[in-house]
């Protein structure tokens, strides 16, 4: 807190300019009018204030707007945004995507801070849903943003927004998140033809059910092993050897290298060894010939 002192003669700030970098904290407090600061916030970012000086400017704005800053000020906060606490940001009502972009730009290249997380939360809640433009903006700044949301939060993402998602945006998503996103992606891309559809849906397939994988196997998609390894184990297990062969196409040879890893390992254990042998890859661990396989899950369903 800066002590209250009168502004020295001749030092009253008539505008926000670089001469203020020479002011002490107490002089900024005494000589810079908060209303002037608010109307000329766009200049602050161009002036090389120290963090100590920015503390004083923030304090002046806090006094002027105890209920939270108006968006006209928020949009021009620039580096002063880094001085804001999540508590400060919770008082804001940010509705403009331009304001959001301006503040994200300040934090660019850094991890998502608690301030940024709070800002995004306030913005998305204010909009009611994660629309395409917002998602586009957020994933541009934070590729991992989508995967930081809970399945419940992801449920508010409209299918139309899925068009903004890039494969790298899903890199850190877990199966629960992909379970939510996959049906939205399927809906979003439903009018595309086979090969184009597969390119778009590929990164979401970690949430795909067995029946959709079976359908894809009929379309000569040639899924790569990296995508196959990310599929849900429970969705892969019911696939036949023939279906997997069709699904992977020329990439089927890669199964040998992955035979000890899920979901390949578990899938091999469910296949007849005879069928595995038809692949000519030397996959071992299938069900020996003459053994009867009971599908207990089907039995439970019938009972």
């Amino acid at each position: 807190e800066v002590e209250k002192t009168a502004c020295p003669s001749g030092k009253k700030a008539r505008e926000i300019d670089e001469s203020l970098i020479f002011y002490k904290k107490w002089e900024l407090e005494a000589c810079v009018d908060a209303a002037l600061l608010a109307t000329q916030m766009d200049r602050v970012n161009a002036i090389p204030f120290t963090y100590e000086q920015l503390d004083v400017l923030k304090h002046k704005l806090d006094e002027l707007y105890p209920q939270g800053y108006p968006e006209s000020v928020i949009q021009h906060l620039g580096y002063l945004f880094l001085k804001m606490s999540p508590e400060d940001i919770r008082k804001w009502n940010v509705t403009s995507l331009e304001t959001l972009k301006a503040l994200l730009e300040v934090n660019k290249g850094h991890e998502m801070s608690p301030q940024v997380a709070t800002l995004i939360d306030r913005f998305v809640k204010g909009r009611g849903q994660l629309d395409k433009d917002t998602l586009d903006t957020l994933t541009a700044f934070y590729p991992g943003y989508l995967c930081s949301l809970s399945p419940e939060e992801l449920s508010s993402v409209p299918p139309s927004s899925i068009w903004a998602v890039r494969p790298q945006d899903l890199d850190t998503c877990d199966p629960r998140q992909l379970d939510v996103l996959y049906p939205k992606a399927r809906l979003a891309f439903q009018n595309m033809n086979g090969s184009e559809y597969f390119v778009k849906i590929q990164s979401f397939l970690g949430g795909a059910p067995t029946e959709d994988l079976k359908a894809l196997s009929q379309q000569n998609v040639s899924m790569d092993l990296a995508t196959f390894m990310k599929l849900r184990t429970d969705a892969v297990l019911p696939l036949t050897v023939a279906e997997v062969q069709k699904l992977l196409g020329p990439h089927v040879e890669g199964l040998k290298a992955e035979e000890r890893h899920r979901p390949v390992r578990d899938w091999i254990l469910r296949q007849r060894q005879d069928d595995l042998d038809t692949l000519g890859l030397g996959l071992q661990g299938g069900i020996p010939n003459g053994y009867l396989v009971l599908d207990l899950s089907m039995q439970e369903a019938l009972s």
């Epitope: 002590e3 670089e18 001469s19 020479f22 002490k24 107490w26 002089e27 090389p48 120290t50 100590e52």
Partner: antibody, heavy 121, light 107 residues
Framework: QVQLQESGPGLVKPSETLSLTCTVS??????????WGWIRQPPGKCLEWIGN???????NYNPSLKSRVTISVDTSKNQFSLKLSSVTAADTAVYYC?????????????WGQGTMVTVSS | DIVMTQSPSSLSASVGDRVTITCRAS??????LAWYQQKPGKVPKLLIY???TLQSGVPSRFSGSGSGTDFTLTISSLQPEDFATYYC?????????FGCGTKVEIK
């Protein structure tokens, strides 16, 4: 480490302009962490602050000298300069350039060795 | 302008003595005060800033105190290399101003 070196004529005629340059070595004048200043000390008298400059060119002068002083910076040469116009014998002094860390309670932490300037015809 | 007044203007002391120099500001300057040491023909050297913060590399026998208008520089045990002139300077507001010095001489 950072060193400062003043240079310029040791003798200036009354009513002329005193010009001095301070060369910064061992560090960049373009650091956002410092102001660069000029201070003088007339023989047997007190130290007097002349003014400060930031690498961007923004400057701040002692009001008692403001009408006669110009401090400028040349980042490409890592130098800053002092010009004092209309000099009189009262401007005879040792002139120091110094570094001033940017902080609320700042102080001149590195000084040049000083250069004696005599104003005489 | 803020006027800085040092006292005494000179003093004589012996090696090992405790020496105290005072500086008074014409108005309150909080703790915006620095102390410098200058030996004959040499450059001023920063000892203390913010009234009591020791500059890096300065021996711990030097200490500063005070706030507002009255400040003190203390040398707890005077060493031969400490014989010099000491200046205070306020950085509370521009124009920065210096005291006219206290000369510490050998008794």
């Amino acid at each position: 480490q950072v060193q400062l070196q003043e240079s310029g004529p040791g003798l200036v005629k009354p009513s002329e302009t005193l010009s001095l340059t301070c060369t910064v070595s061992g560090g960049s004048i373009s650091s956002s962490s410092y102001f660069w200043g000029w201070i003088r000390q007339p023989p047997g008298k007190c130290l007097e602050w002349i003014g400060n400059i930031y690498y961007s060119g923004s400057s701040n002068y002692n009001p008692s000298l403001k009408s006669r002083v110009t401090i400028s910076v040349d980042t490409s040469k890592n130098q800053f300069s002092l010009k004092l116009s209309s000099v009189t014998a009262a401007d005879t002094a040792v002139y120091y350039c110094a570094r001033l860390p940017r902080g609320d309670r700042d102080a001149f932490d590195i000084w040049g060795q000083g250069t004696m300037v005599t104003v005489s015809s | 302008d803020i006027v800085m007044t040092q006292s005494p203007s000179s003093l004589s002391a012996s090696v090992g003595d405790r020496v105290t120099i005072t500086c008074r500001a014409s108005q309150g300057i909080s703790n915006y005060l620095a102390w410098y040491q200058q030996k004959p023909g040499k450059v001023p050297k920063l000892l203390i800033y913010a009234a009591s913060t020791l500059q890096s590399g300065v021996p711990s026998r030097f200490s500063g105190s005070g706030s507002g208008t009255d400040f003190t520089l203390t040398i707890s045990s005077l060493q031969p290399e400490d014989f010099a002139t000491y200046y205070c300077q306020q950085s509370y507001s521009t124009p920065f101003t210096f005291g006219c010095g206290t000369k510490v001489e050998i008794k």
